[in-house]
């Protein structure tokens, strides 16, 4: 409550998160031209990536291009790479959408399809849709513990969202457990009216807002966080404007003294923790 006589000060905050959960992933792979279903277990180290600032990331889906090495190969067929003769390719050309440097040759990709040859990590990553349903659809059952320390230096007051004696086996609930700092990912999405399984396919950005409205006067002391959630990415984004949230990373290895890599296009949810509020004191 805004008391006119109070001196207000904005919150200074630090955040630390811990994600927990295990996912069973059923991946379809092609081995010697035969499709196989591979079961694997993903733990925290497999699906989280270190992020800067007050954010954490959870992988929910992925596409793999295995056994890439640096050599010459035909581009993946697209409108920009298909060609009918060498004239449709240009030596040294680097298209922003391309994965390599053109050699100037138009070569057979497959059957009667011809594409421009490139010097790149080959084979070139295919242009394909993210798997449906998401491979880590079960990530909605993962939980995140949010540790939030706050400070009002002008009022010489420090506190945190986790107080001694808190039941650490709790799960946040808007009405039944509003002070619990452990959040089930699926519940966060339910709160914003979004379907976790839908967002998990292409990825997205979710805001976790922590609002501190602190009255630091001795007789009316109140300083507890209020949690709310907000979808931050544009869910109406047109396909051509890259909906969702994804990035690529590679795992490098050597095979017969040749450097190779597995390229992984990762789709997932970035959670941004937004801490704001004020502390007022007479």
């Amino acid at each position: 409550s805004d008391k006119l006589y109070q001196r207000k000060e904005p919150v200074i905050s630090s955040v630390h998160t811990k994600v927990k959960g295990i996912a069973e992933v059923k991946e379809e792979i092609v081995e010697n031209g035969v499709k196989k279903l591979v079961h694997s277990v993903f733990d925290t180290a497999d699906y989280t990536f270190p992020l800067q600032g007050n954010s954490f990331f959870v992988m929910t889906n992925f596409l793999k291009t295995e056994g890439q090495e640096q050599r010459l190969c035909p581009e993946y067929p697209t409108r920009r790479t298909l060609c009918s003769s060498d004239r449709g390719c240009k030596k040294g050309w680097m298209d922003p959408q391309s994965k390599g440097i053109q050699t100037g040759r138009c070569v057979v990709y497959e059957g009667n399809q011809k594409t421009c040859e490139v010097s790149a990590w080959c084979p070139i990553e295919a242009v394909e849709e993210a798997p449906r349903p998401a491979l880590l659809n079960s990530a909605e059952n993962f939980t995140v513990l949010i540790k939030n320390n706050i400070d009002f230096p002008g009022h010489n007051y420090t506190t945190r969202n986790i107080l001694p004696g808190l039941n650490i086996t709790c799960t946040f609930h808007k009405t039944q457990n509003p002070q619990c700092p452990i959040f089930r990912l699926g519940d966060i999405f339910r709160e914003t009216g979004d379907n976790f399984s839908d967002v998990a396919i292409q990825g997205g950005i979710m805001g976790i807002e922590i609002y501190w409205d602190c009255n630091l006067d001795r007789w009316f002391h109140h300083c507890r966080p209020k949690y709310s959630f907000r979808r931050l990415d544009d869910k109406t984004t047109n396909v051509s404007l890259y909906p969702g949230y994804n990035f690529r990373y590679a795992k490098y290895y050597k095979e017969n003294n040749v450097e190779k890599r597995t390229l992984i296009k990762v789709f997932g949810i970035r959670f941004d923790i937004l801490v704001f509020g004020t502390g007022g004191k007479f």
Partner: nanobody, 129 residues
Amino acid sequence: EMQLVESGGGLVQAGGSLRLSCAASGRTFRHYAMGWFRQAPGKEREFVAAISSYGSTDYGDSVKGRFTISRDDAKNTVPLQMNSLKPEDTAVYYCAAADETLGAVPNFRLHEKYEYEYWGQGTQVTVSS
């Protein structure tokens, strides 16, 4: 979806001239590179001429110096002026459009049929000797 309608085809004597026109509708015309292709019976579709959204042009080797492509962004049309016509110019002429909204089509790609998303139904040109 972009609709393309060709007109101006017909029968002409060798050495004569014809002016084809392509009328576009349904999309922001000025964001598209426009091309003319032709296909003679039993042959592959062949590049004739193209003009990018910013006015850069390219011509097929067999029509250089005889054909001229232009564009009228106010009328959403792409005329193709064909002079000194030869019997080997006989074919169905198609108009095509390539989206340049997210970036220009490189000049060396303007002749590639794969760059073009939208195609007209074609207009017949017959050159008699």
